[in-house]
């Protein structure tokens, strides 16, 4: 065990700083994107090298549910993640260097609200501090965007088409194509949060197939072309 093999710290006569936390009042981001919630702090323990815990919570200070927590061992700049809600929260800052900044991935409208950073010194200098006012995260809705459209081989030399779109609220997807009535039945599945995917299971005719994504903020469309040459399976997109 290496616990007794710690490094000594010299005493410094510089004036001690007080506990404080610096966070912006507000961070704005679009649904589906990532956001950084900045948080830096000062503390009176000038050369604290003991164990520490960094925490972010949502809703209200001191009592709101934790969305992220990590711990750093004595003398370590590596903060080991112990909790990351839905795996979407990641520490960008280095708590040893007074930075608790947090990155939130794949934002949804439901992520809007207040977030509070907190640091705990759990060694000899048993001390903790949490931002009182926090940072307000405003997640704004996003118009639809088609992120992938493709034609893939299906069973028995047939082809199928896939369309993935994102937006907030999640867009409704519809396929149209050269089939009779110019509209085709699509199997629509919910993707990851703000992403949805629709499949057209059997492309029976050559021609242009269009995927349309629509929500309350707008619409987007993209097309693929299916051509089978000389009876051999193949596509041109």
């Amino acid at each position: 065990d290496a616990s007794g093999d710690l490094l000594n710290t010299e005493a410094h006569s510089a004036p001690a700083q007080r506990w404080s936390m610096q966070v912006p009042a507000e961070v704005n981001a679009e649904a589906g994107d990532a956001a950084v919630l900045p948080c830096t702090f000062t503390h009176p323990h000038r050369h604290y090298d003991g164990p520490l815990t960094a925490i972010w919570r949502s809703g209200e200070p001191y009592a709101g549910p934790q969305v992220f927590r990590c711990t750093a061992a004595p003398g370590s700049e590596l903060c080991q993640t112990a909790l990351s809600l839905h795996g979407r929260f990641r520490l960008l800052g280095n708590p040893r260097r007074n930075d608790l900044s947090l990155r939130v991935e794949r934002l949804a409208l439901a992520d809007s609200g207040r977030y509070f950073c907190r640091v705990e010194f759990t060694g000899d200098a048993h001390d903790r501090y949490e931002s009182r006012h926090g940072v307000r995260l405003r997640v704004t809705a996003a118009a639809p965007r088609i992120v992938n459209i493709s034609v893939l081989p299906g069973p028995a030399h047939a082809f199928r088409a896939l369309c993935t779109a994102e937006g907030e609220p999640p867009p409704a997807l519809a396929w149209s194509g050269p089939a009779p009535g110019n509209s085709s039945a699509a199997l629509q599945g919910q993707g990851h949060g703000y992403q949805v995917t629709a499949e057209l299971p059997a492309l029976t005719r050559d021609g242009r197939y269009t995927c349309t994504a629509a929500n309350s903020l707008g619409r987007a469309e993209a097309s693929v072309y299916l051509f089978r040459f000389h009876g051999a399976p193949g596509t041109s997109t």
Partner: antibody, heavy 116, light 112 residues
Framework: QVQLKQSGAELVKPGASVKISCKAS????????VNWVKQRPGQGLEWIGK????????YYSEKFKAKATLTADKSSSTAYMQLSSLTSEDSAVYFC?????????WGQGTLVTVSA | DIVMTQAAPSVPVTPGESVSISCRSS???????????LYWFLQRPGQSPQLLIY???NLASGVPDRFGGSGSGTAFTLRISRVEAEDVGVYYC?????????FGGGTKLEIK
């Protein structure tokens, strides 16, 4: 006590790759970064990069990004560095370092010689 | 990248005397949190480097208090009082304020 034990010397041909290891003991491997440092014969020290045990926290010096690949295996408390497309410029002793402040303990070094 | 410069490639010293080894950085290593992110290492002949000083002025565990570090944001000094034969080797400074970490070229301590 804290120890970092590195793999033995390697003689490799130009263009080949080599993977060297650094086994940690005497402390909780997952709590600290492992740093890698290069030292050419009779020369100074160069920082290559560092890795956290989860292999998500990896930092490289730009100079070594295309040359070195750092990995770690928590189950065996071992960090690895693979060097690719070796040339005579890569002939050096490679050290791993870890524990307090990332550099409190060093491995004994691994000599890599690149020769046809 | 931050450039670390150790102007003297070698310093001769008589056992029992004191010696200072200097190092400069191309950028201040003083962080806004009040810490200065500079290390000093000693590499004895044929051995791995050994940590002597961390954060500019803090003595690493097991290092004799004959060693001391001081400096400002860009100019640093390692002072060894009552030099002993076992102190010979190459002394390196290294910044770890930002990536990539960079070392000075080293200063060789030689016994007269």
């Amino acid at each position: 006590q804290v120890q970092l034990k590195q793999s033995g010397a390697e003689l490799v041909k130009p263009g080949a790759s080599v993977k060297i290891s650094c086994k940690a003991s005497g402390y909780t491997f997952t709590d600290y970064y492992v740093n890698w440092v290069k030292q050419r014969p009779g020369q100074g020290l160069e920082w290559i990069g560092k890795i956290g045990p989860e292999s998500v926290s990896i930092y490289y010096s730009e100079k070594f990004k295309a040359k070195a690949t750092l990995t770690a295996d928590k189950s065996s408390s071992t960090a690895y560095m693979q060097l690719s497309s070796l040339t005579s410029e890569d002939s050096a002793v490679y050290f791993c370092a870890s524990y307090y402040y990332g550099f409190a303990y060093w491995g004994q070094g691994t000599l890599v010689t690149v020769s046809a | 990248d931050i450039v670390m410069t150790q102007a003297a490639p070698s310093v001769p010293v008589t056992p029992g005397e004191s010696v200072s080894i200097s190092c400069r950085s191309s950028k201040s290593l003083l962080h806004s949190n009040g810490n200065t992110y500079l290390y000093w290492f000693l590499q004895r002949p044929g051995q791995s480097p050994q940590l002597l000083i961390y954060r500019m002025s803090n003595l690493a565990s097991g290092v004799p208090d004959r060693f001391g570090g001081s400096g400002s944001g860009t100019a640093f000094t390692l002072r060894i009082s009552r030099v002993e034969a076992e102190d010979v080797g190459v002394y390196y400074c290294m910044q770890h304020l930002e990536y990539p970490y960079t070392f000075g070229g080293g200063t060789k301590l030689e016994i007269k």
